[in-house]
């Protein structure tokens, strides 16, 4: 897959066996009741495919039409496959359902690479292993798309699940979590454990396997250990974030901070990769190169394109350095960090892969967008989108992956001046030229 | 201009080890560019990737051929070498010794080749 | 294991008629894809690489195109040199380690 789209994505088998989640390390205050505890209904309600999606069953329409959607925390828009596609198994048939209302209005999303076209209308919604609701939601029944739906990712849609600043076609188009928060009683925030197997996955292990969970209004103690550290949603459009610092090893890479977050800096579950602004992601494949120089690596592995394969069970871990990002704090001058390893960067890649060897490709990728926490950061953490307290939480998840010598972390405080200079203030443009996805 | 040249025994007994070496005139083995890489090739057949080195010492081998093959080098000469151990008839070929370059990828340049028969 | 598939095996032509080589991969090698050329007693000599680059002091007359797992190799007018084989090596998968197993092109 070209590493410039937002999809596709990538999930798969957590590390840690089903049933044997590590437990907590420490507690935390309690909060408002209903959003903390065991929500064992939903845990585990994600499924996907190594580059491909992390998607959630959904039923849509009366009777219920069950849909696989893929879950998005870079966009807004609630969209179905309303069409047949020969990348499609099923898909959503608005004239069986007795409870559609067309909107008789249209949607076009451009992608850098891509699109997607449709009708917009609203139905009933529900989520079976999510909160035991039913609303109604904005649905955009997609009609036409170019280079969006991937052949075997087994998903039929997308759930936006960022703000309405970048719903399509205008922020007047309410998002589904919005209606989700609006008609019931579930707490404002979800929070998500995306599970990367460490190793590819066919599709019959795909369907069989789970890929994490998506706690729909609250947080499940099972899915973390250690504590949860919170950073101030910057911004309600993506999910915005500052990052204060980055080190490789441990070896910060000493760049105004600014950079870090050149346009912006966000969490994005619809992205494989992390993907960094030009200088930055220079500055650190340089070190990343540098911490494993004992090796040397083709060119077009580093960028994203070659593959390097090693005697299965040969990988050798230890010579591919850390990566830790400071995020701004919620306290004054204080930041923590959340710290991955290679088993998140180092992306596992099916198809290629012989019972010989472990086949890799390296997830850290360029962007003229800002910087994207996507799958290889969110794979190493519990990531807590805390929207009632315009918040992100990272803990160190449960079923990372990870090796004897070295973990995920999340550690804080750290003292750190003058973040607020971090951020990067977008000139205001015309909407109309804003791009959905990646350069 | 790099040149490459390989040495060694045309002759090995079967079970015993093979060892040729390959040195590199007109450049520095030393190049963070490269890899030094050993090819085979059957009488009348294709050709075989047996390995490859870095200046550091780091090494990947063909997976068929790991438990018989070490490849170093040795900077202060300019060489590096192959061992292939436990030879049969089936390891008669000619080796080639190259350079692995062009993104570290490609073999972009090569020995003339040393024919090499495994027979008692 | 991403196999190698050349042909044709052999290919009958003469001089000043223009060659076609294929090479097809059993899964896709996005374009990290050699050609070479063996004459007879010599060593292997890389032609183009990364699909369609020609490497130094190759001629016009050779060029190389697609993507993915179909390749071809092109000689668009023979001269009686190029009557060799010609072998394909994918690099997509590192180390580099697959070559195809090789095109003999021969004067008719």
């Known amino acids: 897959t070209q590493h410039g789209i937002r999809l596709p994505l990538r999930s798969g088998l957590g590390g840690a066996p089903l049933g044997l989640r590590l437990p907590r390390e420490t507690d935390e205050e309690p909060e408002e009741p209903g959003r903390r505890g065991s929500f064992v209904e939903m845990v585990d309600n994600l499924r996907g495919k190594s580059g491909q999606g992390y998607y959630v069953e959904m039923t849509v329409g009366s009777p219920p039409q069950t849909l696989n959607i893929l879950v998005d925390t870079g966009s807004s828009n609630f969209a179905v496959g309303a069409a047949p596609h020969p990348f499609l198994h099923r898909y959503y048939q608005r004239q069986l359902s007795s409870t559609y209302r067309d909107l008789r209005k249209g949607v076009y999303v451009p992608y850098t690479q891509g699109k997607w076209e449709g009708e917009l209308g609203t139905d009933l919604v529900s989520i079976p292993h999510g909160p035991n609701v039913t609303v109604r939601a904005n649905i955009a029944a997609i009609t036409e798309s170019d280079k969006f739906f991937i052949n075997g990712s087994n998903w039929e849609g997308i759930l936006g699940l960022a703000y309405a600043e970048i719903a399509r076609p205008d922020d007047s188009l309410e998002p589904f979590f919005d209606s989700l928060v609006k008609q019931t009683h579930v707490p404002n925030l979800f929070s998500l454990q995306l599970c990367g197997a460490g190793f590819p996955l066919n599709q019959s292990e795909v369907l069989a396997s789970v890929g994490g969970s998506m706690i729909i209004g609250g947080i499940d103690h099972s899915l973390y250990t250690g504590s949860l550290w919170y950073t101030p949603i910057r911004r309600e459009w993506y999910y915005e974030v500052i990052i204060v610092r980055v080190e490789i090893n441990g070896q910060d890479l000493k760049m105004d901070c600014k950079e870090y977050n050149y346009d912006k800096s966000i969490v994005d579950s619809g992205t494989t990769n992390l993907r960094l602004p030009k200088k930055v992601f220079e500055a650190a494949v340089k070190s990343i190169k540098a911490a494993s120089s004992t090796e040397k690596f083709p060119d077009g592995f580093w960028l994203g394109e070659q593959l390097v394969c090693w005697q299965a069970g040969t990988t050798p871990w230890n010579i591919f350095p850390v990566i830790s990002l400071y995020l701004m704090g919620e306290v004054t001058n204080q930041s923590f960090r959340i710290t991955i390893l290679p088993q998140q960067y180092l992306r596992p890649v099916e198809d290629v892969a012989t019972s010989q060897d472990d086949c890799y490709k390296f997830a850290i990728s360029q962007s003229s967008t800002g910087t994207v926490m996507g799958a290889v950061i969110m794979e190493g953490f519990y990531v807590v989108f805390d929207r009632a307290r315009k918040r992100i939480g990272f803990a160190v998840s449960a079923c990372h992956v990870h090796d004897e010598f070295r973990t995920a972390a999340v550690e804080g405080p750290f003292v750190t001046l003058d973040m607020e200079d971090c951020g990067y203030n977008i000139p205001q443009t015309d909407e109309s030229t804003l791009m959905t996805g990646r350069a | 201009q790099l040149q490459l040249q390989e040495s060694g025994p045309g002759l090995v007994k079967p079970s015993e080890t093979l060892s040729l070496t390959c040195t590199v005139s007109g450049g520095s083995i030393s190049s963070s560019s490269y890899y030094w890489g050993w090819i085979r090739q059957p009488p009348g057949k294709g050709l075989e990737w047996i390995g490859m080195?870095?200046?550091?010492?780091?090494?990947w081998y063909n997976p068929s051929l790991k438990s018989r093959v070490t490849i170093s080098v040795d900077t202060s000469k300019n060489q590096f070498s192959l061992k292939l151990s436990s030879v049969t008839a089936a390891d008669t070929a000619v080796y080639y010794c190259a350079r692995v370059g062009h993104g570290i990828s490609y073999f972009d340049l090569w020995g003339r080749g040393t024919l090499v028969t495994v027979s008692s | 294991e991403i196999v190698l598939t050349q042909s044709p095996a052999t290919l009958s032509l003469s001089p000043g008629e223009r060659a076609t080589l294929s090479c097809r991969a059993s899964?896709?090698?996005?374009?990290?894809l050699a050609w070479y050329q063996q004459k007879p007693g010599q060593a292997p000599r890389l032609l183009i690489y990364?699909?369609?680059k020609r490497a130094t002091g190759i001629p016009a007359r050779f060029s190389g195109s697609g993507s993915g797992t179909d390749f071809t190799l092109t000689i668009s007018s023979l001269e009686p040199e190029d009557f060799a084989v010609y072998y394909c090596q994918q690099v997509y998968t590192w180390p580099p380690r697959t070559f195809g197993g090789g095109t003999k092109v021969e004067i008719k």
């Open positions: 899964q896709s090698v996005s374009s990290y």
């Open positions: 990364d699909a369609s």
């Open positions: 080195i870095y200046y550091s010492g780091s090494t």
